[in-house]
Interface confidence: low
């Protein structure tokens, strides 16, 4: 004998208390597939979470993060604080990138500047907290006859000092 619950479509559940009649999911619950014996509780987007898509009888709510935060994890299971470019998030909040590192995004960690000399090149533009160095031609490529490129003086941002 075929289980009559299999006939219950998404958005309903098979109500054993009512002779396996397909009953609509109650408010704030959903079933995304047919034949379910219960409806799942809708996700609530509270606090730093913001509702991106309302819950319906057939699909869960989807959350993203309020301004100043970004999603982490599949389906935005966590919200992490945004930082400014030139910063990274530490246990004590947003902190400027260490000297010699940069971050050009509002999330993620500070990464080391490119070491131009490893590729036999020279520094054309110094790095900052927000931008990587720009490597130029190697010093050997700049023959006296060629138009020379002089790297700028080291950028000194106020208070930005090394280890």
């Amino acid at each position: 004998i075929q289980d009559s619950c299999s006939n219950c479509p998404a958005g309903t559940f098979c109500d054993n208390n009512r002779s396996q009649i397909c009953s609509p999911c109650p408010p704030n619950s959903f079933s995304s597939a047919g034949g379910q014996r219960t409806c799942d509780i809708c996700r609530q987007c509270k606090g730093v979470f913001r509702t991106r898509k309302e819950c319906s009888s057939t699909s869960n709510a989807e959350c993203d993060c309020i301004s100043g935060f970004h999603c982490l994890g599949a389906g935005c299971t966590m919200c992490e604080q945004d930082c400014k470019q030139g910063q990274e998030l530490t246990k004590k909040g947003c902190k400027d990138c260490c000297f010699g590192t940069f971050n050009d995004q509002k999330r993620g960690i500070c990464r080391p500047w490119t070491n131009c000399s490893l590729d036999g090149k020279s520094v054309l533009v110094n790095g900052t907290k927000e931008r990587d160095v720009v490597c130029g031609p190697s010093p050997a490529d700049l023959s006296p006859g060629a138009s020379s490129v002089t790297p700028p003086a080291p950028a000194r941002e106020p208070g930005h000092s090394p280890q």
Epitope: K92, C98, F99, N115, N126, P154, H160, S161, P162, Q163
Partner: antibody, heavy 119, light 107 residues
């Protein structure tokens, strides 16, 4: 085992310059920052500035800006601190110190170099 | 720049707990380190990242940092702990600052 070995004591005249060296061994020289910290007799510790050898550009505490030059020679794993226009109040022990990779602590220190400025 | 203030001296009886404070505006927003310095020797890192102990540092050394104050605590103080202690911090830009130092006397 990381070691920082500094050059010997110096006696200098006011107005002259001194250059102290700090040779590192037992670690990857160019990926750690080397700082210079001084301590005048009976006084506390004072951060002067530092350099990441792999990147070359040094930065300095405001107090020493224009008077101190910190450099590094990767080929010999040696950092240098040159202080110019010496005056008597620059008489101090000068330490080089290595900042460890993940935090703000100086986990290895040189033995210190006494610089005496006297006429 | 942040300025760090320490008491010039702290005295403690052997076996008792010594607490050395270090204050600065919003110091808890930054990481604090502590150094021990004995006469004629280079400083030794005893606490970093507010409360972490480097290997080889006895468990009796601990640290905390919140609000405007970082504290170095030495439980069961021993005679060999008599030394000068310096707090140090760095903001995210890696500008380093030391406190003025505290002389710990074990009575």
């Amino acid at each position: 085992q990381v070691q920082l070995v500094q050059s010997g004591a110096e006696v200098k005249k006011p107005g002259s310059s001194v250059k102290v060296s700090c040779k590192a061994s037992g670690g990857t020289f160019n990926s750690y920052a080397i700082s210079w910290v001084r301590q005048a007799p009976g006084q506390g510790l004072e951060w002067m500035g530092g350099i990441i050898p792999g990147f070359g550009t040094a930065n300095y505490a405001q107090k020493f800006q224009g008077r101190v030059t910190i450099t590094a020679d990767e080929s010999t794993s040696t950092a240098y601190m040159e202080l110019s226009s010496l005056r008597s109040e620059d008489t101090a022990v000068y330490y080089c110190a290595r900042k460890n990779e993940e935090d703000g602590g100086f986990d290895h220190w040189g033995q210190g170099t006494l610089v005496t400025v006297s006429s | 720049d942040i300025e760090l203030t320490q008491p010039p001296s702290v005295s403690v009886a052997p076996g008792q707990t010594a607490r050395i404070s270090c204050s600065g505006d919003n110091l808890g927003d930054y990481y604090a380190s502590w150094y021990q310095q004995k006469p004629g020797q280079a400083p030794v890192l005893v606490i970093y990242d507010d409360s972490n102990r480097p290997s080889g540092i006895p468990e009796r050394f601990s640290g905390s940092n919140s609000g405007n104050t970082a504290t170095l605590t030495i439980s069961g103080t021993q005679a060999e702990d008599e030394a000068d202690y310096y707090c140090q911090t760095w903001d995210g830009t890696l500008h380093f600052v030391f406190g003025g130092g505290t002389k710990l006397t074990v009575l």
